[in-house]
Interface confidence: low
Amino acid sequence: QSPPGKPEIHKCRSPDKETFTCWWNPGSDGGLPTNYSLTYSKEGEKNTYECPDYKTSGPNSCFFSKQYTSIWKIYIITVNATNEMGSSTSDPLYVDVTYIVEPEPPRNLTLEVKQLKDKKTYLWVKWLPPTITDVKTGWFTMEYEIRLKSEEADEWEIHFTGHQTQFKVFDLYPGQKYLVQTRCKPDHGYWSRWGQEKSIEIPNDFTLKD
């Protein structure tokens, strides 16, 4: 039996700059029941506070609801592990909520096969920003990637589209079925997970519609 090992704050992420969650990896428990507490202070403030909500985001986590989330201050966060033999504290993590945003994936992905006048076929991929994202006001500046592959292929082909919410993919093989996904990333934030997969077959004999 021994004091607990040093916990490590794994990451903090916010879906929308309005709330955020931090997760930690416990160290060894020293073979004893061990309690974990997350405490934080804010840049320029002397007070230290305990995690407001240990439940919402699951085990070894702390959820900061709107009431506890500020984008104007840096949070200095630590996790403390305590058992009857002693205690240990994680290295502090400095968090600016603006920089930990991991949004939901883009929505409303649509795929359409189109043809130019020279009979060249292309896939027109369109999508919308995630619901929570207030892109119009500049609160978020979102960048996007799409990835696609034919059903037979092992590797995804990735295209960075910048701020565009549409992309044209040329040089696809007729008769092949293609899978497409999108993801997004705000300024200085993290990529969302890849969104729902959509598929489309490129026709062999595409006839131009008026």
Partner: antibody, heavy 118, light 112 residues
């Protein structure tokens, strides 16, 4: 104590490549971005790019795009900066720097002098 | 790219006297989130740069309170209330609101 220890000085021929390493210790490597900044002799500082070691996501200064590649090896807590197609103007001290939390540089390596000369 | 212009280029100061360095950016450094990512670094002779001030006016840990930062938008100032011998070196302002991050040309501070 946070430490960034860089590889030693290099002398390279024009047209070749150089790869500088930056070994981090004293903190959780995946929690903070690593940046690369260079300083030509007697000149100011120039930001080259950054990497998030947790997922190897990178941003580059477009000036170096295509010539610079920044990578990170989580298993050894080491970041790398490779610069290709070297020219004499690339002679500089190259620094790695760790962000305070994201994008200002609280901790710096000791610098690596790269000399490009025929 | 954002151009950061520092003045003066060099400064010779008597110990105990104040010093002031100005930094002007070619565009506003106010991020869409409302924060201003303007920072100050000092590079002492033969050393790597060190962080003094982040986000306009926040002193980094261990930085003496004789250093202060102020400003908004495009105009910023670093003040040293009483210059000491250990303050010699080149001071750089830097912005990280816009990619690529950029630095000013530097201001060399010497002791008279």
């Amino acid at each position: 104590e946070v430490q960034l220890v860089q590889s030693g000085a290099e002398v390279k021929k024009p047209g070749s490549s150089v790869k500088v390493s930056c070994k981090a210790s004293g903190y959780t490597f995946t929690s903070y971005w690593i940046h690369w900044v260079r300083q030509a002799p007697g000149q100011g500082l120039e930001w080259m790019g950054e990497i998030d070691p947790s997922d190897s996501y990178t941003n580059y200064n477009q000036k170096f795009k295509g010539r610079v590649t920044i990578t990170a090896d989580k298993s050894t807590s080491t970041a790398y900066m490779e610069l290709s197609s070297l020219r004499s103007e690339d002679t500089a001290v190259y620094y790695c720097a760790r962000s305070f939390f994201t994008n200002w540089f609280a901790y710096w390596g000791q610098g690596t002098l790269v000399t490009v000369s025929s | 790219d954002i151009v950061m212009t520092q003045t003066p280029l060099s400064l010779s100061v008597t110990p105990g006297q104040p010093a002031s360095i100005s930094c002007r950016s070619s565009q506003s450094l106010v991020h869409s989130n409302g924060n201003t990512y303007l920072h100050w670094y000092l590079q002492k002779p033969g050393q790597s740069p060190q962080l003094l001030i982040y986000k306009v006016s926040n002193r980094f840990s261990g930085v003496p309170d004789r250093f202060s930062g102020s400003g908004s938008g495009t105009d910023f100032t670093l003040k040293i209330s009483r210059v000491e011998a250990e303050d010699v070196g080149v001071y750089y302002c830097s912005q990280s609101t816009h990619v690529p991050f950029t630095f000013g040309g530097g201001t060399k501070v010497e002791i008279k």
